[in-house]
């Protein structure tokens, strides 16, 4: 399956925080989305192979890495002024 953690996260002003996403499905592609209240999902970043990733529609204030196939952590940087949202990680073949 695919596992995201933590379930809830509070960020202090000026801090970077990292959201974990792990999958054991042998999927090449992984994605991070953000959903704000009353809105649809918006793509932040996606990765299609190890050590390669592309910006989505709202990458500003976020960073990612893809050091291994199973993992695609998202860092919400201090530059992200409005981080409060629902974050969703996904993967696909």
């Amino acid at each position: 399956g695919i596992t995201q953690s933590p379930k809830y996260l509070f960020r202090k002003e000026g801090q970077n925080v990292t959201l974990s996403c792990e999958q054991n499905l042998n999927h090449d592609a992984m994605y991070w989305y953000r959903q704000d209240p009353g809105q649809g999902l918006r793509l932040i970043y996606y990765s299609q192979i190890v050590n390669d990733f592309q910006k989505g529609d709202i990458a500003e204030g976020y960073s990612v890495s893809r050091e291994k196939k199973e993992s695609f952590p998202l860092t919400v940087t201090s530059a992200q002024k409005n981080p409060t949202a629902f974050y969703l990680c996904a993967s696909s073949i």
């Epitope: 592609a29 192979i49 050590n51 390669d52 990733f53 592309q54 893809r66 050091e67 291994k68």
Partner: antibody
């Protein structure tokens, strides 16, 4: 900052096995990425030999696959190249290398290179 | 294997010149994920190659803006807009779309 350093004999006899080791510092080879061996012939041409992945899986150049083994020692944070049945055509500078974050498979962390001569 | 053919093999130019090196692959370098894994390296004598451009057109960290890459499919170009003395070196293209990863034969850029 990832640093790589090759070690091993500079002279190998024909028909013997070439053995080189790459010691990695600044990053654990089990944490991610691909750990490559690349060689450069005296005429300056570059050839990718193969890699060992963070999970221990391998990918080899088919032209060398029957003679090459890339393995690792995770306790020492090292990975190694063995090339059997060498001939003078295997004389080259051998580099270990790994990709820079986010570049796909493009490598930019290189060892200093070790010159291997095959001669009796 | 994918053959990578660079031209010219050698090139004489002067400081301030605009220089273009081309690289042609024997098959398309577009990966099944639609990315193109074509890279350019610079090598100076006695040193390991250094990454200049990755994925066709992305300048690697610390690489001056006078270096640029372009192209698609099978035809790619490295351009140096205004040659500096430190740019005289050998340049290689490389592909990592298909295994085995392969390199061009190199272009030696010399001072005129």
């Amino acid at each position: 900052q990832v640093q790589l350093q090759e070690s091993g004999p500079g002279l190998v006899k024909p028909s013997e096995t070439l053995s080189l080791t790459c010691t990695v510092s600044g990053y654990s080879i089990t944490s991610g990425y691909f750990w490559n061996w690349i060689r450069q012939f005296p005429g300056k041409g570059l050839e990718w030999i193969g890699y060992i992945s963070y999970d221990g899986s391998n990918n080899y150049n088919p032209s060398l696959k029957s003679r090459v083994t890339i393995s690792r020692d995770t306790s020492k944070n090292q990975f190694s190249l063995k090339l059997s049945s060498v001939t003078a055509a295997d004389t080259a500078v051998y580099y270990c290398a790994s990709p820079s974050p986010g570049t796909g498979y493009a490598v930019d962390y290189w060892g200093q290179g070790t010159t291997v001569t095959v001669s009796s | 294997d994918i053959q990578m053919t660079q031209s010219p093999s050698s090139l004489s130019a002067s400081v301030g010149d605009r220089v273009t090196i081309t690289c042609r692959s024997s098959q398309s370098l577009v990966h099944s994920n639609q990315n193109t894994y074509l890279h350019w390296y610079q090598q100076k004598p006695g040193k390991a190659p250094k990454l200049l451009i990755y994925k066709v057109s992305n300048r690697f960290s610390g690489v001056p803006s006078r270096f640029s890459g372009s192209g698609s499919g099978t035809d790619f170009t490295l351009t140096i807009s205004s040659l500096q003395p430190e740019d005289f070196a050998t340049y290689y293209c490389s592909q990592s779309t298909h295994v085995p990863f392969t390199f061009g034969q190199g272009t030696k850029l010399e001072i005129k």
